[in-house]
Interface confidence: low
């Protein structure tokens, strides 16, 4: 009996040591990544940013609200998380890509056009699970039908054509608050990733029945957080198999 108890304790201790080793390895990996990020940002210590500040800085769109709330739940959950998902399973990651300006876009018809997206190397065409363009439509005064058109910029053709349609949809808007609208752009994104030179940007139009453009493309001083953006979900296939 004594022997079996002793053996059990040794096994338990061995398992705990393994857990501790794994946890320490994970922690040191995370710390190393944090140090890299801070050095890239030229910061000595991590900024102390509250959830409220994050809410102000990020676009005010549904997927980001969900992410922030999710992060909050994770942070509040003090129970030890399982390492299993982390180490052995395929995970999906949501990457939010904000538009950047492109010289080419700025020259179209002498007016600024939105939007041009530069993609993280993490986004590979065969790993894209979902890609949605989110646009904010300003509030309307009367019930109206809105025609949303997403056009892809192309190199000017002989006939002068600069655009090709990606998506168009018709939606009814009622007075009140503006709305966030998502549009599936997975195929376009995959094509851009295969042929980066074809990525010259897009133009967003959301015209009501009177030709009034409701899409926020270049947020003004009072439109912080209403930029269009891409929500891309990528899958990260497992790098290790269970030993």
């Amino acid at each position: 009996n004594e022997n079996s108890e002793q053996k059990e304790n040794v096994e338990k201790e061995g398992l705990c040591n393994a857990c501790t080793w794994r946890q320490n390895t994970k922690s040191s990996r995370i710390e190393a990544i944090k140090i890299q990020i801070l050095s890239k940002l030229r910061l000595e210590t991590a900024p102390n940013i509250s959830k409220d500040v994050i809410r102000q800085l990020l676009p005010k769109a549904p997927p980001l609200r969900e992410l922030i709330d999710q992060y909050d739940v994770q942070r509040d959950d003090s129970s030890d998380g399982s390492l299993e998902d982390d180490d052995y399973h395929a995970t999906t990651e949501t990457i939010i890509t904000m538009p950047t300006e492109s010289d080419f876009l700025m020259q179209v018809d002498g007016k600024p056009k939105c939007c041009f997206f530069k993609f993280s190397s993490k986004i590979q065409y065969n790993k894209v699970v979902k890609a949605q363009l989110w646009i904010y439509l300003r509030p309307v005064e009367t019930p109206t039908t809105v025609f949303v058109q997403i056009l892809r910029l192309i190199k000017p053709m002989k006939d002068g054509t600069r655009y090709t349609g990606i998506r168009s949809l018709k939606l009814d808007m009622n007075p009140g608050t503006g709305i966030w609208q998502s549009i599936d752009v997975k195929t376009v994104l995959q094509n851009w990733l295969k042929q980066p030179e074809s990525n010259l940007g897009i133009e967003i139009k959301a015209l009501d029945e009177n030709g009034h453009d409701l899409a926020v493309t270049f947020p003004g001083p009072g439109e912080d957080g209403l930029n269009p953006f891409l929500e891309v979900k990528v899958t990260d296939t497992p790098k290790r198999s269970r030993r």
Partner: antibody
Framework: QVTLKESGPVLVKPTETLTLTCTVS????????ISWVRQAPGKGLEWVGI???????YYASWAKGRLTISKDTSKNQVVLTMTNMDPVDTATYYC?????????????WGQGTLVTVSS | DIVMTQSPATLSLSPGERATLSCTSS????????LSWFQQKPGQPPKLLIY???TLAYGVPSRFSGSGSGTDFTLTISSLQPEDAATYYC??????????FGQGTKVEIK
């Protein structure tokens, strides 16, 4: 129906503080920017300041240090406070939806309220 | 400080004539097109006519049109109507929460 209405004192003494209220209806202030613009009698329009839907404030350079714009979303009100009033501040003060010069801002205005600064 | 200059100060034309109002900014407006035109009649608040330099606001007659980019802008009324007698203002946005109005052009109908 969407409306904006300015209210406040019609007469203010020099060095006193002016407080004007813009009461909106049919507008959600958490989704709408409000601008203040003034117009001296017989003169042109002059931009005063903005409070964005997110509560960010932007003031005209001449008004910095004297001007505060705040809002109470639950009361549907935007408040302009200007200290150290001077006779040159005599003007009709307007509140407007959105930001004039940005997109279709300034598509809706209050009727304005004439404020006279005099002892 | 930003200065927006409108010319002429007064424009006196007959009904049916074409009116051309000019607005010049001392520095380029943001994104080359953050410019609006407003119409104001005595005792009334301003009315938005044109935004993004050339986009006609909701409910504005098509005889009004806007053009230009950067620092030079024009408001054109193709065929003046008696009800167009008013003062017209341009308003420019410069990013960073900076805005300015022109001093106005008064349009009189002979």
């Amino acid at each position: 129906q969407v409306t904006l209405k300015e209210s406040g004192p019609v007469l203010v003494k020099p060095t006193e503080t002016l407080t004007l209220t813009c009461t909106v209806s049919g507008i959600d202030l958490s989704h709408t920017d409000i601008s203040w613009v003034r117009q001296a009698p017989g003169k042109g329009l002059e931009w005063v300041g903005i409070i964005s839907y997110a509560g960010k404030k932007y003031y005209a350079s001449w008004a910095k240090g004297r001007l505060t714009i705040s809002k109470d979303t639950s009361k549907n009100q935007v408040v302009l406070t200007m200290t150290n009033m001077d006779p040159v501040d005599t003007a009709t003060y307007y509140c407007a939806r959105g930001v004039p010069a940005y997109s279709h801002g300034g598509d809706l205005w209050g009727q304005g309220t004439l404020v006279t600064v005099s002892s | 400080d930003i200065v927006m200059t409108q010319s002429p100060a007064t424009l006196s034309l007959s009904p049916g004539e074409r009116a051309t109002l000019s607005c010049t900014s001392s520095q380029s407006v943001y994104h080359a097109n953050w410019l609006s035109w407003f119409q104001q009649k005595p005792g009334q608040p301003p009315k938005l006519l044109i935004y993004w330099a050339s986009t006609l606001a909701y409910g504005v007659p098509s005889r009004f049109s806007g053009s230009g980019s950067g620092t030079d802008f024009t408001l054109t009324i193709s065929s003046l109507q008696p009800e167009d007698a008013a003062t017209y203002y341009c308003a420019g946005g410069y990013g960073g929460g900076r805005y300015a109005f022109g001093q106005g052009t008064k349009v009189e109908i002979k």
